[in-house]
Amino acid sequence: SERCDDWGLDTMRQIQVFEDEPARIKCPLFEHFLKFNYSTAHSAGLTLIWYWTRQDRDLEEPINFRLPENRISKEKDVLWFRPTLLNDTGNYTCMLRNTTYCSKVAFPLEVVQKDSCFNSPMKLPVHKLYIEYGIQRITCPNVDGYFPSSVKPTITWYMGCYKIQNFNNVIPEGMNLSFLIAFISNNGNYTCVVTYPENGRTFHLTRTLTVKVVGSPKNAVPPVIHSPNDHVVYEKEPGEELLIPCTVYFSFLMDSRNEVWWTIDGKKPDDIPIDVTINESISHSRTEDETRTQILSIKKVTSEDLKRSYVCHARSAKGEVAKAATVKQKVPAPRYTVEGGGGTGGLNDIFEAQKIEWHEGGGHHHHHHHHHH
C-alpha cells in the first residue's frame, strides 16, 4: 500500500470505558492532528476507516460492524459501542484516506470493570470545592452526545457505595450535585449513573469523580515566611556548617504557582562562588494549603560567608514577600580557668558541643540542625 502519514500510538488519549456501557469515541485525527474537521474531509471525498489490534496481539484486523444489534457502529468521526465488552480492549486506529492522501493515528482503549461501589482502575478527574464557600456544584461529566435532548434520562448520584437521598448538605439536582456548604468530610468519590432508553433497550453511563475540598479564596493570604524570623540568630564560627531553613506557608489558590528561593548578597546562589546546597521539602494540609521549606546549607562556612546577606523570598498569586536571616560570626568566649577543674570551666565545652543558635528575647537554644517554626 502507498505511504500513509502515521501519527503512531497516541498514548495521551488513554481512553478508559466501563464494561457493559455505551461508549462513543471520536477519531483523534480531527481533534489533535489535522487542521480540518470531519465534515470538510468527508466533502473532499476522504473516507474514514477503522481497524484495531486486540490486547496482546500484533495483528491488525478490521472492526466487525455486523454484530447483533449493531453493537459496534460508526457515525461520522465517532466509533460507537452499544455496549462495550471486556474483550474490546486494544489499540484502535482511525485512518483517513483517498487515492492521493492518507493519515492515521492509533489510540489505546481499555474496557474496565467496576465493583458495586464503583471502584475500578479508571483514572478519576478531580473536582475542587472551596471550603465553607456557599453553594457549589459538580456536573456529571462526559455524557454529551449519548442521547438526544428529547430523551429525559434518570440520574442517580452516589457517594462511594451510597445513593445520595437524604444527605444534609448535598442535594442531587439532575445532572448536577449541589453542595450547600462544603466541608472536609465531603472529600471522596461521587458517582452519577445516567440511565436512558434507546431503541427499546436501557443503557447506563457511570461517571465517577473525586471531590477535594480546598482552602477558600476568601481566606487566602500572601505567602507567610515563618523562618527565617527576628527571633533566631544564626551564629557560627568559621569552619562550621551553616544551615538556614526558609519555611513558607502558602494559602491554597487555584492554579497558583508557589515559589520559594534564596538570594545571597542579592544574587541567586548559583551565581555566587561558594559551595551552597539547597534542599526543598513540600507538605500540604488537608485543604491543600502548602508549606515549603528550603534549607540553605554551607558545609564549611568562612568568615566572608558570615558577612553576607541571606534573604528568603516567596511568591504566589497573592503577592511576594522576603525575609533576611540574621547571620553572625560567633565571638569565641574567654576561657575561664578555675582551680581544681570545677566551677564554670565546663560551660564552654557544653556550649561548644551544642553549636547553638540564640533565640533573642527567649534565651532558648536549638541544635543547629533543627528547623525553626
Epitope: N119, C161, Y162, G188
Partner: antibody
C-alpha cells in the same frame, strides 16, 4: 487502632423499645458508614440498616422499616440503633460494624449487644 | 432481594485437612462477595472480600474463588483455630444479604 464499643446487654418487655449504642474510636468517625447487623440465637446474620454520620442519611432493610431508627452523634463519635415494638423474635445479639464509604464489607465490628425480649 | 445459600450446613474435617465451603447467589453478584469467620461468643471477622482478596492479617491458607453466582472458600490445611462458622455476604445489590452459614467442626 479502630474500636467499636457497644452498650451492655438489655432485657426488654414485648411492645417496648431498646436503644443500643456503638462508640467508635481510632479513625475519623465522619469517614465511615455505621451498619447494624443482628444475629438471633443459633441463627445467621441479618443486615438491618446503616447511617452515614457525616451526612445524616440512614437507610433500613425493608423488614425493619418503620420499627428501626439509626442515629449518630458526631460530637461523641457514637451511633445508636433503636428498635421499637419489640417481640420475642427480636431476641438477638445486635452488632454495629464500620464500613468505609467506598467498600461494602464489614471490616470492623463491635463486640455485640444481647437484647432479650421476654415477658 | 438476593438469597445466598451456603452448603454444606455442617462440614466435619480433621485438622490438617482441606475444607471447601460453597456459597451460591440467587442471581449474579459479580465478584461483590465477602467471607466472614465467627467463633462462639465473638463478632464475625472479615476473611475475604471481592470474592478472592484476603483481608489484612488473614493467613494464606484461606482463599476465595468464584464470580457470578458460584463461590468457594477454601481452607488448605485446617488449624485448630479455624473450627468456626463461616458466612458469605453479597454486596452487589441492596439489601446486602448473608448466607445462613457453614459450621466447620472437628471430625
Amino acid at each position: 487502632q479502630v474500636q467499636l464499643v457497644q452498650s451492655g446487654a438489655e432485657v426488654k418487655k414485648p411492645g417496648s423499645s431498646v436503644k443500643v449504642s456503638c462508640k467508635a474510636s481510632g479513625g475519623q468517625f465522619n469517614d465511615y458508614a455505621i451498619h447494624w447487623v443482628r444475629q438471633a440465637p443459633g441463627q445467621g446474620l441479618e443486615w438491618m440498616g446503616y447511617i452515614i454520620p457525616a451526612y445524616g442519611q440512614a437507610e433500613y432493610a425493608q423488614k425493619f422499616q418503620g420499627r428501626v431508627t439509626i442515629t449518630a452523634d458526631e460530637s461523641t463519635s457514637t451511633a445508636y440503633m433503636e428498635l421499637s415494638s419489640l417481640r420475642s423474635e427480636d431476641t438477638a445479639v445486635y452488632y454495629c460494624a464500620r464500613v468505609p464509604y467506598s467498600t461494602a464489607y464489614f471490616d470492623y465490628w463491635g463486640q455485640g449487644t444481647l437484647v432479650t425480649v421476654s415477658s | 432481594e438476593i438469597v445466598m445459600t451456603q452448603s454444606p450446613a455442617t462440614l466435619s474435617v480433621s485438622p490438617g485437612e482441606r475444607a471447601t465451603l460453597s456459597c451460591r447467589a440467587s442471581q449474579s453478584v459479580s465478584s461483590n462477595l465477602a467471607w466472614y469467620q465467627q467463633k462462639p461468643g465473638q463478632a464475625p471477622r472479615l476473611l475475604i472480600y471481592g470474592a478472592s482478596t484476603r483481608a489484612t492479617g488473614i493467613p494464606a491458607r484461606f482463599s476465595g474463588s468464584g464470580s457470578g453466582t458460584e463461590f468457594t472458600l477454601t481452607i488448605s490445611s485446617l488449624q485448630s483455630e479455624d473450627f468456626a462458622v463461616y458466612y458469605c455476604q453479597q454486596y452487589n445489590n441492596w439489601p446486602w444479604t448473608f448466607g445462613q452459614g457453614t459450621k466447620v467442626e472437628i471430625k
